[in-house]
């Protein structure tokens, strides 16, 4: 009885299509695979950024796999062929591993790359990124930002830079069609007559960096002798009501009475008849139903009642 063996895949490689971190892992079938034509051969693929503790593992019948990586670090991957037990009348047969690596040859020292990169997706409408120049770089250094997300044919360069002292220190992005809930890749590279500049790579999802506008139309309504309902409206823009969390700060007679987080556009407050002044502000944030993270909006304008009996009046501003 001859032992069944299978070769590893051929020409296993990591291909960079120029999407700033979204890479293709691809391979060719092992030689003599047609001996197992009646049988579906599978491949076990393992990959990770160099320095990561854990491998991602995929089992596939395809000859390629695509995923996002951090190009600030190298990438390593390995693959082997799997013959399921149905093909071998016994136990699963595995080939030896084929291995490959990929990294972008770094130019310049790490200090030359941009510092304090910060991106905010204002009101789920306008993306703005800002950065500080690298440490010790000269004024002739200029930085360029490129971005890509699935749906674009190729990486695009920023066309509206924010400048300071003639240097690009930020980018105002155009309208980004169908760009949320998918990885958004950015590279900021640079050029200088003086010395090479290190590139920086960033990946995030736009819905996780949204900073909404503050709520509007704050009102008071007396519900009963000891309850006041605070109400407000969602900010203008594309974010639906179901996506908001709110934080309220209420002051009664110059004392912070309540700070609360709520999911609706109302909050009921217990009060006493002695209350002479009541003020509140609200801010909004995208909630866990619509994103994994977010940025609190600025506080709304303050809405106050003072000097009148709250029981006799609905106050609007």
């Amino acid at each position: 009885d001859t032992e069944i063996k299978v070769n590893p895949p051929q020409d296993f490689e990591i291909v960079d299509p120029g999407y700033l971190g979204y890479l293709y892992l691809q391979w060719q079938p092992p030689l003599s695979l047609d001996h197992f034509k009646e049988c579906t051969v599978e491949y076990e693929l393992k990959y990770r950024n160099i320095g990561s503790e854990t491998w991602k593992t995929i089992i596939t019948k395809n000859l390629h796999y695509k995923d996002g990586f951090d190009l600030n670090k190298g990438i390593e991957a390995k693959i082997h062929t799997l013959l399921p037990w149905q093909c071998t009348n016994g136990s699963e047969v595995q080939s030896s591993w084929a291995e490959t690596t990929y990294w972008i040859s770094p130019q310049g020292i790490p200090e030359t790359k941009v510092q304090d990169m910060d991106c905010v997706y204002y009101n789920w409408q306008y993306l703005l990124c800002s950065w500080k120049p690298g440490i010790g770089v000269l004024l002739d250094t200029n930085y360029n930002l490129f971005y890509w997300y699935e749906g674009l044919d190729h990486a695009l360069q920023c066309v509206d830079y924010i400048k300071a002292d003639g240097q690009n220190i930020g980018c105002r992005f155009p309208y980004l069609e169908a760009s949320d809930y998918k990885d958004f890749y950015i590279c900021v590279n640079g050029s200088s007559e003086n010395k090479p500049i290190r590139s920086s790579y960033f990946t995030f999802q736009l819905q996780n960096i949204v900073k909404p506008l503050p709520p509007v139309y704050l009102t008071f309504t007396r519900e009963s002798s000891c309850e006041i309902k605070l109400k407000w409206s969602i900010p203008l823009g594309p974010i639906p009501a179901r996506c908001f969390d709110y934080e309220i700060e209420i002051r009664e007679d110059d004392t912070t009475l309540v700070t609360a987080t709520v999911e609706n556009e109302t909050y009921t407050l217990k009060t006493t008849n002695e209350t002479r002044q009541l003020c509140f502000v609200v801010r909004s944030k995208v909630n866990i139903y619509c994103s994994d993270d977010g940025i609190w909006s600025e506080w709304s304008d303050k809405q106050c009642w003072e000097g009148e009996d709250l029981s006799k009046k609905t106050l609007l501003r």
């Epitope: 020409d11 490689e13 291909v15 293709y24 060719q28 079938p29 030689l31 047609d34």
Partner: antibody, heavy 118, light 107 residues
Framework: QVKLVESGAEVVKPGASVKLSCKAS????????MSWVRQAPGQRLEWVAT????????YYPESVKGRFTITRDNSTSTLYLEMRSLRSDDTAVYYC???????????WGQGTLVTVSS | DIVMTQSPLSLPTTLGQPVSVSCKAS??????VAWYQQRPGQSPRALIY???YRYSGVPDRFSGSGSGTDFTLTISRVEAEDVAVFFC?????????FGGGTKLEIK
């Protein structure tokens, strides 16, 4: 449909260099290895070079190793063969071919004649 | 290098007849053999891979067989458009090598 279109015919002197190109269309170029194969007048086909889909792997026979370089530009779906130190026995029709999943060649270009003559 | 030896060099036949072309490898190449057809003045066209599997669009009168060192291309009924040179190729190991070709002619 799959199409491979090579650059035009070349006449060069011995010792000179030339760079052939092959423009591909009708398939995802970066997913396929590509090869160059040549055929001297009245002779058998002779494999010249192969490059993997991403360009990480290149293969040559001893007869051209060090003189010929196969490259590819996946952004323009173009395959290249740079030939240096050409000799009269390099005279042939050069075909670009797509490598199928088993290293056979499933689609071929129309061929380009390279004549090396003093 | 693996040498691929084809026979016969020339194959005169009549329309509608079956013909076979032989290809012998100088060492074991498993089933890693392809067959190509080159009509006069044209580029090669792929017919068979992995010794016996037809590429799509290839008429079923073409078939391949063999493994190890002995391989055969068979045309069950020759048609006028089959006039060409047929080449075998091994891809079991680099360098990839081709047979010398068999010229199919109509008598």
């Amino acid at each position: 449909q799959v199409k491979l279109v090579e650059s035009g015919a070349e006449v060069v002197k011995p010792g000179a260099s030339v760079k052939l190109s092959c423009k591909a269309s009708g398939f995802t170029f970066s997913s396929y290895g590509m090869s160059w194969v040549r055929q001297a007048p009245g002779q058998r086909l002779e494999w010249v070079a192969t490059i993997s889909g991403g360009g990480s792997y290149t293969y040559y026979p001893e007869s051209v190793k060090g003189r010929f370089t196969i490259t590819r530009d996946n952004s323009t779906s173009t395959l290249y063969l740079e030939m240096r130190s050409l000799r009269s026995d390099d005279t042939a029709v050069y075909y670009c071919a797509r490598r199928d999943l088993r290293s056979a060649m499933d689609y071929w270009g129309q061929g380009t004649l390279v004549t090396v003559s003093s | 290098d693996i040498v691929m030896t084809q026979s016969p060099l020339s194959l005169p036949t009549t329309l509608g007849q079956p013909v076979s072309v032989s290809c012998k490898a100088s060492q074991n190449v498993d089933i890693n053999v392809a067959w190509y057809q080159q009509r006069p003045g044209q580029s090669p066209r792929a017919l068979i891979y992995s010794a016996s599997y037809r590429y799509s669009g290839v008429p079923d009168r073409f078939s391949g067989s063999g493994s190890g060192t002995d391989f055969t291309l068979t045309i069950s009924r020759v048609e006028a458009e089959d006039v060409a040179v047929f080449f075998c190729q091994q891809y079991n190991a680099y360098p990839l090598t081709f047979g010398g070709g068999t010229k199919l002619e109509i008598k």
